[in-house]
């Protein structure tokens, strides 16, 4: 069961490194995507700038220190940052008062560069992906992650925060990203509705029926918002999700505990679990470039790790994913996802040949882009 | 200062119950996890039950599925475990322990209290 | 018997260095679960050592440290000292078993 252009073992050319939800931010169609059926209508992006405060709920965690005793550092429960800006994107105003990346929306007004200038910056996300057009950079090495396999106690928070569904991760989650070090905060989803598919990033042009992104915050950096504008400083894995003949497991995890939490602003606990689990095995084999969150505050300089393998889950639990949860304005939580941006001469990097058989429709040749870590 | 106080331990014949209680203090019990690990005589460490943080989850392991009962009243500060249709093999000291490390650590023990179960 | 093993014992005179290995299987250890480690002294609880595999609680001295391979992991004691004799204890979770797992622990004798 693979969509056009990625199947689970085939390249996907998905985003890169990135943290597309970290502050919740919400993406707004750009000019390089032109609206399509299910594009939520976006916001045009004005130039502007990109630390404000983050999107989705990312917490405002401290890298943890092995002096510092563990239960006060791992067992309380993990802040979120303020704002709560990681929401999936909804049809409706937020209630909430405050800040005023808390008042946005998918598709309609505000428009987001309003809410947050940096929305209108020139290096946003998502973006679509065109394998065959990517850089084949050797030295990209295959992912690394530590600790993402939680024991079922502690239980974990899990919200629906008017944009999206967020999964709170504990501290000690590492993920090495070439030299550097990231801490996972946050995971989250984006989706469509029936019969449309929800992801943020495309490949060639492909939506996916949605797509998991998992929040981090470089090792260089204390807090979120330190970190938020600068390069580097937040880092997104994201994988597609698409549709399988079996029930994902590890989803099920969490897909099953969605009606408790069908209200917005509503969340419970769940038992921990392998986070890596949600992910696609093969962690070699990815697209990575630098982008933006994808909500407001959409802050740039943020790492997009997107891999090329997707993951299955069933029809049934696909359909439990998109139909389930409630936003603001008593409208669906649906199609949560910002359109796609326009690259302005960036190179999207990939771990592998990507541009060689990549996909099912592969073109006459096309001259590569040269990897900028070439040699490294 | 964190602690946990444990009490209820004692001599009881075999297929006989006892309920052992753990107050906590010093740290909000209401947001962790808790165990009970107990330790035969001269023998190793061995888990017994956990509670999730909100009581709504219990996890025991197979040797005493069925017959001890694990709880907590987070308006008390106490953790719980009810012991039925106790075995010689029960025998031991029983500890109290916080769970709440998300790496899956014990933080907090209780100082321990003694279960004899003969005839 | 323990999923996880460890050495029954071991000993050191003061001032040296030992180690304590654990090793398990692909279900605990092998699939990315932390491994902790406990020092119970004779007559009290188990106290927190190492968490995380490499972690040190505040006030647990620089001397012992953790590490974590493959299957196994190891905790390493520097600078032996006479109160450092006490049972030592390897921890993790199973995720076939579904238990919280402890080693069969190890006796540390600090010798003369």
């Known amino acids: 069961q693979r969509l056009p252009r990625m199947q689970e073992d085939s390249p996907l050319g998905g985003g890169s490194s990135g943290e597309d939800d970290p502050l919740g931010e919400e993406d707004l169609p750009s000019e390089e995507d032109s609206p399509r059926e299910e594009d939520p209508p976006g916001e045009e992006d004005l130039p502007g700038e990109e630390d404000l405060p983050g999107e989705e709920d990312l917490p405002e965690v401290k890298p943890k220190s092995e002096e510092e005793g563990s239960l006060k550092l791992e067992d309380l429960p993990t802040v979120e940052a303020p704002g709560d800006p990681q929401e999936p994107q909804n049809n409706a105003h937020r209630d909430k008062e405050g800040d005023d990346q808390s008042h946005w929306r998918y598709g309609g007004d505000p428009p987001w560069p309003r809410v947050s200038p940096a929305c209108a910056g020139r290096f946003q996300s998502p973006v679509d992906i065109r394998p065959q057009l990517a850089a084949f950079c050797p030295a990209l090495r295959p992912l690394e992650l530590l600790g993402f396999q939680l024991p079922p106690l502690p239980e974990l928070r899990l919200r629906n925060n008017g944009h999206s569904v967020q999964l709170t991760l504990p501290p000690g989650l590492e993920m090495a990203l070439g030299p550097g070090r990231e801490y996972a905060l946050q995971l989250h989803l984006h989706w469509g509705a029936a019969g449309r598919p929800g992801s943020e990033h495309t490949v060639e042009g492909h939506r996916f029926p949605a797509e998991i992104h998992v929040v981090h915050l470089s090792t260089a950096f204390a807090r979120v918002d330190e970190a938020l504008g600068r390069p580097g400083g937040l880092a997104v894995l994201a994988a597609f999700l698409e549709e399988g003949p079996e029930e994902n497991s590890a989803y099920e995890q969490l897909l099953s505990r969605l009606e408790e939490i069908a209200e917005e602003g509503s969340e419970t606990q769940v038992p921990g679990l392998d986070i890596s689990a949600l992910l696609p095995s093969d962690f070699s084999r990815y697209f990575q470039y630098e982008g933006s969150l994808t909500t407001p505050p959409c802050a740039q300089g943020v790492i997009w790790t997107v891999f090329n393998q997707t993951v299955m889950l069933s029809a049934k639990q696909l359909h439990t994913l998109s139909d389930t949860l409630w936003g603001p304005g008593d409208s669906r939580l649906q199609l949560n996802f910002r359109a796609t941006q326009p690259l302005n001469g960036r190179v999207i990097e990939a771990s592998f040949p990507a541009g060689v058989d990549s996909s099912p429709r592969a073109a006459e040749p096309v001259q590569l882009n040269s990897c900028l870590a070439a040699g490294d | 200062q964190v602690q946990l106080v444990q009490s209820g331990g004692g001599l009881v014949q075999p297929g006989g119950s006892l309920r052992l209680s753990c107050a906590a203090s010093?740290?909000?019990?209401?947001?962790?996890?808790m165990s009970w690990v107990r330790q035969a005589p001269g023998k190793g460490l061995e888990w017994v039950s956990a509670?999730?943080?909100?009581?709504?989850?219990?996890y025991y392991a197979d040797s005493v599925k069925g017959r001890f009962t694990i709880s907590r009243d987070n308006s008390k500060n106490t953790l719980y475990l009810q012991m039925n249709s106790l075995r010689a093999e029960d025998t031991a000291v029983y500890y109290c322990?916080?769970?709440?490390?998300?790496?899956?650590?014990?933080?907090?023990w209780g100082q321990g209290t003694m279960v004899t179960v003969s005839s | 018997q323990s999923v996880l093993t460890q050495p029954p014992s071991v000993s050191g005179a003061p001032g040296q260095r030992v180690t304590i290995s654990c090793t398990g299987s692909?279900?605990?250890?092998?699939?990315?679960?932390?491994v902790h480690w406990y020092q119970q002294l004779p007559g009290t609880a188990p106290k927190l050592l190492i968490y995380?595999?490499?972690n040190r609680p505040s006030g647990v001295p620089d001397r012992f440290s953790g590490s974590k391979s493959g299957t196994s992991a190891s905790l390493a004691i520097i600078g032996l000292q006479a109160d450092d004799e006490a049972d030592y204890y390897c921890?993790?979770?199973?995720?076939?078993?579904?238990?919280?797992?402890f080693g069969g622990g190890t006796k540390l004798t600090v010798l003369g």
């Open positions: 692909s279900s605990n250890i092998g699939a990315g679960y932390d």
């Open positions: 995380g595999n490499t």
């Open positions: 509670i999730s943080a909100n009581g709504g989850t219990t």
């Open positions: 921890q993790s979770y199973d995720s076939t078993l579904r238990v919280w797992m």
């Open positions: 010093g740290f909000p019990f209401s947001s962790y996890a």
């Open positions: 322990a916080n769970n709440g490390n998300y790496r899956g650590a014990f933080d907090i």
